[in-house]
């Protein structure tokens, strides 16, 4: 039994890091393998992660962490019974994939302005809480070409757009994702989308 593709890990910089790897053949990950991980810090104990299958030869493990700071480093040991298959390390702050924002809501009752709000996925005491920026994707269910991205580069989890920038009388969907420049993170997954019917008063044309 050998490791074909070494484990690669990403952290949500809060409580979970996810590691994936591939074996050289079909493997029952949960019965045959164990991933041991330990924070390099005084008195930290080693923890065991039981991997799940991720395709025939692929395995995935969700490492639980109490908290994360930028200097944290973990040792990783992949075992098959008494055999050490792979030894490595992982620095969560260098491989961050933020959590997806939640509670995306479209408020349509503010004159002819659409107000989109969502929730920051981190608690205020987490370092990323004040460092996330967002991308909001709005698209028409009727017209695949009507697809736009708004970059929200300020901290407030909201976006105002004029309803008139969208077509009236049709349904739109929106979703939002996050990233943090400070850690050069990847983008988060998209939030669940929300749907609304866009309607606004056309301005009265004078002849």
């Amino acid at each position: 039994m050998k490791v074909l593709q070494e484990p690669t890990c990403v952290s949500d910089y809060m409580s979970i890091s996810t590691c994936e790897w591939k074996m050289n053949g079909p493997t029952n990950c949960s019965t045959e393998l164990r991933l041991l991980y330990q924070l390099v810090f005084l008195l930290s104990e080693a923890h065991t992660c039981i991997p799940e299958n991720n395709g025939g030869a692929g395995c995935v493990c969700h490492l639980l962490m109490d908290d994360v700071v930028s200097a944290d480093n973990y040792t990783l040991d992949l075992w098959a019974g008494q055999q050490l298959l792979w030894k490595g390390s992982f620095k969560p702050s260098e491989h961050v994939k933020p959590r997806a924002p939640g509670n995306l809501t479209v408020h349509t009752n503010v004159s002819d302005t659409l107000l989109l709000t969502w929730s920051n996925p981190y608690p205020p005491d987490n370092y990323l809480y004040n460092h996330l920026t967002y991308a909001v994707n709005i698209w028409s269910e009727n017209d695949p070409a009507d697809f736009r991205i708004y970059n929200v580069t300020y901290l407030e989890p909201s976006l105002r757009i004029a309803a008139s920038t969208l077509k009236s009388g049709i349904s739109y969907r929106a979703r939002v994702r996050a990233w943090a420049q400070c850690y050069n993170t990847t983008w988060s997954e998209w939030s669940p989308s929300t749907k609304w019917h866009n309607s606004y008063r056309e301005p009265f044309e004078q002849h």
Epitope: V40, L43, E45, V69, A71, D72
Partner: antibody, heavy 125, light 106 residues
Framework: QLQLVESGGGLVQPGGSLRLSCAAS????????MTWVRQAPGKGLEWVSA????????NYADSVKGRVTISRDNAKNTLYLQMNSLKPEDTAVYFC??????????????????WGQGTQVTVSS | SYELTQSPSVSVALRQTAKITCGGN??????AQWYQQKPGQAPVLVIY???RRPSGIPERFSGSNSGNTATLTVSGAQAEDEADYYC?????????FGGGTRLTVL
């Protein structure tokens, strides 16, 4: 109030053994990491060993590794330091202390917030 | 292994400001603590997390930490501040103390 009282020190010959104890009171002993720090005559502080709250994890200074064992009995609110193969350079006052691990401003801390008065260990022939 | 360097002694006139430094490679990326020890007594924590004061420690004690130097400042030093002062950090799997600085109040 919080109290840490060391005992078990004394005069021992090189190569001998000694077991230090530290009786804790005034706080929930089983919830805290504990540590030993020593101070040779006229010298500075030197960390010796630490143990986590449940007793499942320990760390040792290189200078004592393999000769010293830290342990605790949470039912008795007592911390121990078993010292073997003692050398003259182990002569010091040994302090038992309560340690805290926490996170502040995106950095991990390990610090000592309470100390006992110490017990003298002298290794001499 | 990680090392912390302190000057052996610092003198300060009564009610003046004393600065005690602790040097270490990139110590600013770590969290520094300071302990006060008077002759024949156990040490006492005076600063933790670079600049936080435990309850009961006078406001004249303050701390800072950046680059390769952590600093303990005693503003308006009193006679009772005469003591040895030790800086401390953690590194990998060890606790590291500086060699100590004797503060003399003149």
């Amino acid at each position: 109030q919080l109290q840490l009282v060391e005992s078990g020190g004394g005069l021992v010959q090189p190569g001998g053994s000694l077991r230090l104890s530290c009786a804790a009171s005034g706080f929930t002993f089983s919830s805290y990491d504990m540590t030993w720090v020593r101070q040779a005559p006229g010298k500075g502080l030197e960390w010796v060993s630490a143990i986590n709250s449940g007793g499942g994890s320990t760390n040792y200074a290189d200078s004592v590794k393999g000769r010293v064992t830290i342990s605790r009995d949470n039912a008795k609110n007592t911390l121990y330091l078993q010292m073997n193969s003692l050398k003259p350079e182990d002569t010091a006052v040994y302090f038992c202390a309560r340690a805290l691990r926490t996170v502040v401003h995106d950095r991990r801390l390990f610090y000592i917030d309470s100390w006992g008065q110490g017990t003298q260990v002298t290794v001499s022939s | 292994s990680y090392e912390l360097t302190q000057s052996p002694s610092v003198s300060v006139a009564l009610r003046q400001t004393a600065k005690i430094t602790c040097g270490g490679n990139n110590i600013g990326s770590k969290s520094a603590q300071w302990y006060q020890q008077k002759p024949g007594q156990a040490p006492v924590l005076v600063i933790y997390a670079d600049s936080r004061r435990p309850s009961g420690i006078p406001e004249r004690f303050s701390g800072s930490n950046s680059g390769n130097t952590a600093t303990l400042t005693v503003s308006g030093a009193q006679a009772e501040d005469e003591a040895d002062y030790y800086c401390q950090v953690w590194d990998t799997s060890a606790v590291v103390f500086g060699g100590g600085t004797r503060l003399t109040v003149l």
